[in-house]
Interface confidence: low
């Protein structure tokens, strides 16, 4: 007998063809011999089956000897053998209805697990293969699990259910909730305004949550909360902000924080934690602030950086258009008795300048000027 696979919630059309290309009497029955539908002349008649309100046919095709059974809003329990009786013949069609659902919300936090559950009719033994948006294949039976979801897992998952050498395809849209970047570093000269941005890697119609920026200043013995906030329908409202520093926060997404001045006492690293309503767990983004200061005190020209710098970063002091006078993998460098001119303090990584501060050294009878 013919096998047809259907998807839960979809519509299926089971075909039945007579040799005569004209409208003749036909009946569709289920395996219990209960009439589903048929015709009386040009009228569609329905039997007492459970499919009553979901079963239909195409009258326009009857004159061509085609008597389809259309079942709308398919349910797993519609899986059955359907018999078309026409011209003293019986055509049997086995319908197998499958459903595939994500057993949790389809919006999942980065690092969480996705479980896809297959609903299948009794007696069936389907195999399932799913392909993630990044091309990763997973196979399984009634359930498929993917642990430690990554940002690249966001998108449409295509799952193929195979049964009796027939297949049916499901598409499930998965949104992995995460920040675009796990970590970021901001390099600033002392006194400059600092902008921290925390863009999300997803868009949803309605976004609700709350969050906090917890900060560990390099020069402080303990970490503290710099700001707490609510996120309601993509609108940000500040709950509490520490008095020093006096952070400001943008009212719209992406989450945006402004520190009026970069000061050595603020240099360090922070963790922005965002709790999304109805989600177990939180989103995190690490943010680091590196602050540079160049000063001349009496006969000593000093350049310092504060904050989380990697050991491979190079700190240099050089007179403009000349070779570096001093260059070290340290957080402070100095030159004694610097000659007059424009000095540059450079923080660089493999030759790439990350941060630069200029200081003008005047002849010894005057005081230094910082541009």
């Amino acid at each position: 007998k013919k096998v047809v696979l259907g998807k839960k919630g979809d519509t299926v059309e089971l075909t039945c063809t007579a040799s005569q290309k004209k409208s003749i009497q036909f009946h569709w029955k289920n395996s219990n011999q209960i009439k589903i539908l048929g015709n009386q002349g040009s009228f569609l008649t329905k039997g007492p089956s459970k499919l009553n309100d979901r079963a239909d046919s195409r009258r326009s095709l009857w004159d061509q000897g085609n008597f389809p059974l259309i079942i709308k809003n398919l349910k797993i329990e519609d899986s059955d053998t359907y018999i078309c009786e026409v011209e003293d013949q019986k055509e049997e069609v086995q319908l197998l209805v499958f459903g595939l659902t994500a057993n949790s919300d389809t919006h999942l936090l980065q690092g969480q697990s996705l479980t896809l559950t297959l609903e299948s009719p009794p007696g069936s033994s389907p195999s399932v293969q799913c392909r993630s948006p990044r091309g990763k294949n997973i196979q399984g039976g009634k359930t498929l699990s993917v642990s430690q979801l990554e940002l690249q897992d966001s998108g449409t998952w295509t799952c193929t259910v195979l049964q009796n050498q027939k297949k049916v395809e499901f598409k499930i849209d998965i949104v992995v909730l995460a920040f675009q970047k796990a970590s970021s570093i901001v390099y600033k000269k002392e006194g400059e305004q600092v902008e921290f941005s925390f863009p999300l890697a997803f868009t949803v119609e309605k976004l609700t949550g709350s969050g906090e920026l917890w900060w560990q200043a390099e020069r402080a013995s303990s970490s503290k909360s710099w700001i707490t906030f609510d996120l309601k329908n993509k609108e940000v409202s500040v709950k509490r902000v520490t008095q020093d520093p006096k952070l400001q926060m943008g009212k719209k997404l992406p989450l945006h924080l402004t520190l009026p001045q970069a000061l050595p006492q603020y240099a360090g690293s922070g963790n922005l934690t965002l709790a999304l309503e109805a989600k177990t767990g939180k989103l995190h983004q690490e943010v680091n602030l590196v602050v540079m200061r160049a000063t001349q005190l009496q006969k000593n020209l000093t350049c310092e950086v504060w904050g989380p710098t990697s050991p491979k970063l190079m700190l240099s002091l050089k007179l403009e258009n000349k070779e570096a006078k001093v260059s070290k993998r340290e957080k402070a460098v100095w030159v004694l008795n610097p000659e007059a001119g424009m000095w540059q303090c450079l923080l660089s990584d493999s030759g790439q300048v990350l941060l630069e501060s200029n200081i003008k050294v005047l002849p010894t009878w005057s005081t230094p000027v910082q541009p």
Epitope: S104, K206, T208, K232, N233, E277, A278
Partner: antibody
Framework: EVQLVESGGGLVQPGGSLRLSCVAS????????MSWVRQAPGKGLEWVAN????????YYVDSVKGRFTICRDNAKNSLYLQMNSLRAEDTAVYYC????????????WGQGTLVTVSS | DIQMTQSPSSVSASVGDRVTINCRAS??????LAWYQQKPGKAPNLLIF???SLQSGVPSRFSGSGFGTDFSLTITTLQPEDFATYHC?????????FGQGTKVEIK
């Protein structure tokens, strides 16, 4: 100020048809999903149908599928519910509601319009 | 369809009382739950969304909690204007469904 005003209710015989309208003001209508919710006399609330911002997606409760049609005209800031093959059990106050609340909540509701199906 | 069952169906209380209304979903709905207040002859009014978040303008004596299948709405200090019917509603999957309602009456 957000406002939703329903109209079109009335007395209709079983098997008859009615078309309910809901005119929205005070917000960008085309940016929101919209719903119809009904309440039979002395009973609880029953969600009937909803439609996406542009009307491309529509969902219905099983009891009205095939009989009721939800549609919208964003140019007229209007939501409609075409009700055919009406039954006595469809008698209810019909509310138009905006799905503008977070977590898909219905944040604004109209005052309702009464539909009575009786012979 | 997901069934939403509210308990109790009615509660008699006095002004100043603490009232808790429960709502149970027949299957997990995460935090896709809203609470509405309805007064006779009026449209429902949104109180709580996302199971626990207070809608703007709603007094802080109202609070919601829960996750998955079991939820509750609490009115810490009942006020005269709180005597009404309260409905929970799931928005996890279509068709959206409401509880049968809980009437808070004056004792």
């Amino acid at each position: 100020e957000v406002q939703l005003v329903e109209s079109g209710g009335g007395l209709v015989q079983p098997g008859g048809s009615l078309r309910l309208s809901c005119v929205a003001s005070g917000f960008t209508f085309s940016s929101y999903w919209m719903s119809w919710v009904r309440q039979a006399p002395g009973k609880g609330l029953e969600w009937v149908a909803n439609t996406k911002e542009d009307g491309s997606d529509k969902y219905y409760v099983d009891s009205v599928k095939g009989r009721f049609t939800i549609c919208r005209d964003n140019a007229k800031n209007s939501l409609y519910l075409q009700m055919n093959s009406l039954r006595a059990e469809d008698t209810a106050v019909y509310y138009c509601a905006r799905e503008g609340g977070q977590w898909l909540a219905l944040d604004y509701w109209g005052q309702g319009t009464l539909v009575t199906v009786s012979s | 369809d997901i069934q939403m069952t509210q308990s109790p169906s009615s509660v008699s209380a006095s002004v100043g009382d603490r009232v808790t209304i429960n709502c149970r979903a027949s299957q997990g709905i995460s935090s896709w739950l809203a609470w509405y207040q309805q007064k006779p002859g009026k449209a429902p009014n949104l109180l709580i969304f996302g199971a626990s978040s207070l809608q703007s303008g709603v007094p802080s004596r109202f609070s919601g909690s829960g996750f998955g299948t079991d939820f509750s709405l609490t009115i810490t200090t009942l006020q005269p204007e709180d005597f009404a019917t309260y409905h929970c509603q799931q928005a996890n999957s279509f068709p959206w469904t409401f509880g049968q309602g809980t009437k808070v009456e004056i004792k």
